[in-house]
């Protein structure tokens, strides 16, 4: 009998609100034995695959997808899926990447926490998160959003 594959998780380092031109790394995690991790954009037809899978812990494997210099076009929802022979897993929750415009270099204002989407979490979109602190001084026009529906 085939095992039930656990849902992957997705996180972003150093976070999900990234200054224009700075780097970000998406980290996909799943069980050991994963052959391929896939990082998907909102459309399932836009994705990156990697077989560069490492063991994050005795029970977890991971793959890392780095963007060296984020642009407005990188903003939007991302999710992970993996292939553990002989089948593909379910998708992780969405993780929303926000790109913040900077005034004079890749460094600027501040917003809420929440930079990972685990197997049981909502996407990290804290406009829906009653526990997240209010944004301190970051105006909407400073962020590049990609609106989507879950």
């Amino acid at each position: 009998q085939e095992e039930d594959l656990p849902r992957p998780s997705i996180s972003a380092e150093p976070g999900t609100v990234i200054p224009l031109g700075s780097h970000v790394t998406f980290v996909c995690r799943g069980p050991v034995g994963v052959q391929t991790f896939r990082l998907e954009r909102e459309s399932r037809s836009t994705y990156n695959d990697t077989e560069d899978v490492s063991q994050a812990s005795p029970s977890e494997s991971e793959a890392r997808f780095r963007i060296d210099s984020v642009s407005e076009g990188n903003a939007g929802p991302y999710r992970c899926i993996y292939y553990k022979p002989p089948k593909w897993s379910e998708q992780s929750d969405y993780l929303e990447l926000l790109v913040k415009e900077t005034s004079g270099g890749p460094d600027s204002p501040d917003t809420e926490p929440g930079s990972s989407a685990g197997p049981t979490q909502r996407p990290s979109d804290n406009s829906h998160n009653e526990h997240a602190p209010a944004s301190q001084g970051l105006k909407a026009e400073h962020l590049y959003h990609h609106h989507h529906h879950h």
């Epitope: 380092e13 150093p14 976070g15 780097h23 204002p109 926490p113 929440g114 526990h131």
Partner: antibody, heavy 118, light 108 residues
């Protein structure tokens, strides 16, 4: 009022083990990554590791194997094993997530002192 | 492994004066650098993040800047309350977290 407080420090003999507990109030651990940082007497800050909202843990290279971070709904534990005199320090628990960065800390506990001595 | 080299180890300045502290990263960390203030017997307090942005409630006397992998922290119009040890920290990723060695600021 949001707060973080460490407990469990004290005197331990070399080779022993100790578990420190960080108790949080006023916010949910399901929304914040929590880190541990230590400071030897008269020395600088040293990052130990942290735990993601959904439980994945990360450690400094020197801490892997001897230090383990875990959490419940309201506490974050740091289990330390095979302790040596070099582990004598004040241990701080800190909340990450400021400006949406995982390990940017803006809420710290007062610290708890751990002394390793025979 | 990422290393942050902070200089000087200590500095003395007069009330009303200016202090400058440097932090050199051993590899590129974009602008992912923060500065903390720590007074004796207290935990650190976040002052600056993203190299130059002030954390909430921090006065504009504190200033940060970046040039490549070199970061500079300046306190102007020094007050007695600024006597403390200051640390830089990178939050570049979960695997390269590091603090600088610290700079003790004395006010004369």
């Amino acid at each position: 009022e949001q707060s973080v407080e460490e407990s469990g420090g004290g005197l331990v003999a070399p080779g022993g083990s100790l578990t420190l507990t960080c108790t949080v109030s006023g916010f949910s651990l399901s929304n914040y990554h929590m880190g541990w940082v230590r400071q030897a007497p008269g020395k600088g800050l040293e990052w130990i590791g942290y735990i993601y909202t959904h439980g994945t843990t990360f450690y400094a290279s020197w801490a892997k194997g001897r230090f383990t971070i875990s959490k419940t709904s309201t506490t974050v534990d740091l289990k330390m094993t095979r302790l040596t005199t070099g582990d004598t320090a004040t241990y701080f628990c800190a909340r990450g997530g400021y400006a949406d960065y995982n390990i940017l800390y803006n809420l710290w506990g007062p610290g708890t002192l751990v002394t390793i001595s025979s | 492994e990422l290393v942050l080299t902070q200089t000087p180890a200590s500095v003395e300045a007069a009330v009303g004066g200016t202090v400058t502290i440097n932090c050199q990263a051993s590899q590129s960390i974009s602008s992912y650098l923060a500065w903390y203030q720590q007074k004796p017997g207290q935990p650190p307090k976040l002052l600056i993040y993203d190299a130059s942005d002030l954390a909430s409630g921090v006065p504009s006397r504190f200033k940060g800047s970046r040039s490549g992998t070199e970061f500079t922290f300046t306190i102007s119009d020094l007050e007695c309350a600024d006597a403390a040890t200051y640390y830089c920290q990178t939050y570049d990723s979960s695997t390269t977290a590091a603090f600088g060695g610290g700079t003790e600021v004395e006010i004369k």
